[in-house]
């Protein structure tokens, strides 16, 4: 008789999850000299230990502490780029602007980017069939708790001017329920962070509106100001040109507004 298995609403663990995490760890440590002493076997053991044999709706930040310790990494605190609902462009930007970092440019973010994982209570098995959905099942699931933990730490580390890339094509340009809105905004440290600068990325070719006047941006400004952090906002009307100008700042067309 097959053992009864909990059916969750979300997709199951990404196939070849252990192999993917280990391979990514080795690749990352190879590329980043300051992380070459990292023991990827220990990293995987700590990652696994955070969720294996535990109920996937009962995961805590504490479960991830060994992994957080192993992934401790110093990034320049004044070179942090946060993003919300516009990951691809943020990553394209830091691939060009090599001295700036998104969370996924750190070891822990790189390991988990685009992956799903969960286990089962009291068994050492990884659940490849289904994992809890944040909305439909539970918020304290392995993936959500991981991203909440690393996002909090990343925001806490930031200093000086922090940039955030926001998607101007969405109905809520700033969404209080996003990881940025619910975690990162509230964990920026006012004693270290002087300014949060939002870059609102326009989607349409002919979109010339000032999206910095959007009500949700005003809401973000209000939250940030109440936390004693200055706020500034820029429209990025042409994201393609924006990236091109980051690559080639000397280009004559890069003096005009992008």
């Amino acid at each position: 008789v097959p053992r009864w298995r909990q059916q969750w609403s979300g997709p199951g663990t990404t196939k070849r999850f252990p192999e993917t995490v280990l391979a990514r760890c080795v690749k990352y440590t190879e590329i980043h000299p300051e992380m070459r002493h990292v023991d990827c076997q220990s990293v995987w053991d700590a990652f696994k230990g955070a969720f294996i044999s535990k109920h996937p709706c009962n995961i805590t930040e504490e479960d991830y502490q060994p992994l957080m310790k192993l992934g401790t990494q110093t990034v320049p605190c004044n070179k942090i780029l946060l993003w919300s609902r516009i990951k691809d462009l943020a990553h394209q930007f830091t691939q060009v602007q090599r001295d700036m970092f998104t969370l996924e440019d750190t070891l822990l973010g790189y390991l988990a980017d685009d992956l799903t994982w969960c286990g089962e209570f009291n068994t050492s098995k990884i659940n490849y069939q289904s994992c809890p959905d944040w909305r439909k099942d539970c918020s304290n699931n392995p993936v959500s708790v991981f991203w909440k933990t690393v996002s909090r730490r990343f925001a806490e580390a930031a200093c000086d001017v922090v940039h955030v890339m926001l998607n101007g094509s969405r109905s809520k340009i700033f969404d209080k329920n996003s990881t940025f809105g619910s975690v990162e905004v509230h964990n920026l440290q006012p004693e270290k962070v002087q300014t949060l600068e939002a870059w609102v990325i326009h989607g349409g070719r002919e979109d010339s509106r000032d999206l910095c006047q959007d009500p949700t941006i005003k809401e973000l400004e209000s939250i940030i100001s109440k936390r004693n952090i200055q706020f500034s906002c820029k429209n990025i009307y042409r994201p393609d040109k924006f990236l091109q100008c980051v690559k080639n700042p000397e280009d004559s067309s890069c003096t005009s507004e992008i």
Partner: antibody, heavy 121, light 107 residues
Framework: QVTLKESGPALVKPTQTLTLTCTLS??????????VGWIRQPPGKGLEWLAH???????RYNPALKSRLTISKDTSSNQVFLKIASVDKEDTATYYC?????????????WGQGTLVTVSS | EIVLTQSPATLSLSPGERVSVTCKAS??????VAWYQQKPGQAPRTLIY???YRYSGVPARFSGSGSGTDFTLTISSLEPEDFAVYYC?????????FGQGTKVEIK
């Protein structure tokens, strides 16, 4: 098979610079992911990590000795060198080189047999 | 720097006995610990890495355990060739450090 062999002067005078050589075989330091480190052991005492160097010339030093240490490599001869400046009696030790690998942590899977260096006038 | 304290300094035992050597780190190193065996006049030899993984070719009687600050090397049944000095090493952070060693001698 993988082997490492240390060589250097058996005797050096205080204040001189000691140069040690680690000759590698069975693997190449031009191969991605490989590194070689130096560890020493004073007579009757424990082990001390000194420095290591990676295939791409990234170097790491023990902060307590950093000002006196220089690690380098010659890929063509498959050798790694360690220079210790201004030696004194406390530098008398058996010096080992060992291999490390990216992604495995900095533990030493392979060791040379060691070379004993005495600092004396 | 992280200080590793091994205990005991010396163990006097007979072949066939079980051995436990402990290594205590001055701060949490998760599982980034290796164990080495060193015989007189020889270089150290790797036994255990990542706290609990036996290195290739190492007999099954050797095992490692622990995480955080407390680690143990166990030899389930001492063989005559196991009489040696055992060192732990942390590679969690620079500078990498070793314990002072534990000598396992014949009683």
């Amino acid at each position: 098979q993988v082997t490492l062999k240390e060589s250097g002067p058996a005797l050096v005078k205080p204040t001189q610079t000691l140069t040690l050589t680690c000759t590698l075989s069975g693997f190449s330091l031009s191969t991605s992911r490989m590194g070689v480190g130096w560890i020493r052991q004073p007579p009757g005492k424990g082990l001390e990590w000194l420095a290591h160097i990676w295939w791409d010339d990234d170097k790491r030093y023990n902060p307590a000795l950093k000002s006196r240490l220089t690690i380098s490599k010659d890929t063509s001869s498959n050798q790694v060198f360690l220079k210790i400046a201004s030696v004194d009696k406390e530098d008398t030790a058996t010096y080992y080189c060992g291999r490390i690998e990216v992604g495995r942590g900095a533990w030493f899977a392979y060791w040379g047999q060691g070379t004993l260096v005495t600092v004396s006038s | 720097e992280i200080v590793l304290t091994q205990s005991p300094a010396t163990l006097s035992l007979s072949p066939g006995e079980r051995v436990s050597v402990t290594c205590k780190a001055s701060q949490d190193v998760v599982t980034t610990v290796a164990w080495y065996q060193q015989k007189p006049g020889q270089a150290p030899r790797t036994l255990i890495y990542s706290a609990s993984y036996r290195y290739s070719g190492v007999p099954a009687r050797f095992s490692g355990s622990g995480s955080g600050t407390d680690f143990t090397l166990t030899i389930s049944s001492l063989e005559p060739e196991d009489f040696a000095v055992y060192y732990c090493q942390q590679y969690y952070t620079y500078p990498f450090t070793f314990g002072q060693g534990t000598k396992v001698e014949i009683k």
